[in-house]
Amino acid sequence: FERTRSLQDPCSNCPAGTFCDNNRNQICSPCPPNSFSSAGGQRTCDICRQCKGVFRTRKECSSTSNAECDCTPGFHCLGAGCSMCEQDCKQGQELTKKGCKDCCFGTFNDQKRGICRPWTNCSLDGKSVLVNGTKERDVVCGPSPADLSPGASSVTPPAPAREPGHSPQ
């Protein structure tokens, strides 16, 4: 079977790490230095990716697999296979064309990347704000105001009797 297949298409027998060399009557040749082929049957080897500048090498290139890059400290990867490096900002900021800017009031960012997002609107779920939001943190929603009003039905045990004139906390 191997002999038959190789007569039909000799290139199909070339394993990863090699290419089908047209200059040598289509025999399989190992990839030249700093190139790779990650699958069999290739007619060329691909040039290894070089991680330069803001990119740094996460995995070295080999004859059967490309190099993998990540970003130097202070930057993070964007795109498939870390095709770009973007500057980090602090929590509570977002990256704009003019650099890192604080989140506007009513928005937050709890990461070093990405954009500022609006605080959760607790009232949309019929809840109240338990903890106020900041530039770095979203609001924390608590029980609905109705749950806090006197006489409201609740699955929790009733609070101890209070002196007249004192409303619940």
Epitope: G17, P30, C31, P32, C61, S62, S63, T64
Partner: nanobody, 111 residues
């Protein structure tokens, strides 16, 4: 240029072993990839085993687990240890680096 000379071929019975040698001379500092090929009469030259540029040894499926490529840089020599030889391993074996080829050494597996 690099000059390559193979040796170690011969007649062996099925299941036997041979060790081929490939001695390099000339501008050997340029050698990054070195390979063993084999070719029978009227057949395509076939890659068998090689040291890639990253110094990793590779083998084609038909010889994996039976053949081992190694090298002795002090002797400027690359070896192909061939164990559990089969009738279909009969071929002329060539050493290659870049555009340089050895003259070949005949390996015959026969009972």
């Amino acid at each position: 240029a690099v000059q390559l000379v193979e040796s170690g071929g011969g007649l062996v019975q099925p299941g036997g072993s041979l060790r081929l040698s490939c001695a390099a001379s000339g501008n050997i500092s340029s050698i990054r990839v070195i390979s063993w090929y084999r070719q029978g009469s009227g057949k395509q030259r076939e890659l068998v085993a090689w040291f890639a540029w990253d110094n990793v040894a590779h083998y084609v499926d038909s010889v994996k687990g039976r053949f081992t490529i190694s090298r002795d840089n002090t002797k400027k020599t690359t070896y192909l240890q061939m164990n559990s030889l089969k009738l279909e391993d009969t071929d002329v074996y060539y050493c290659n680096s870049g555009d340089s080829w050895g003259q070949g050494t005949q390996v015959t597996v026969s009972s």
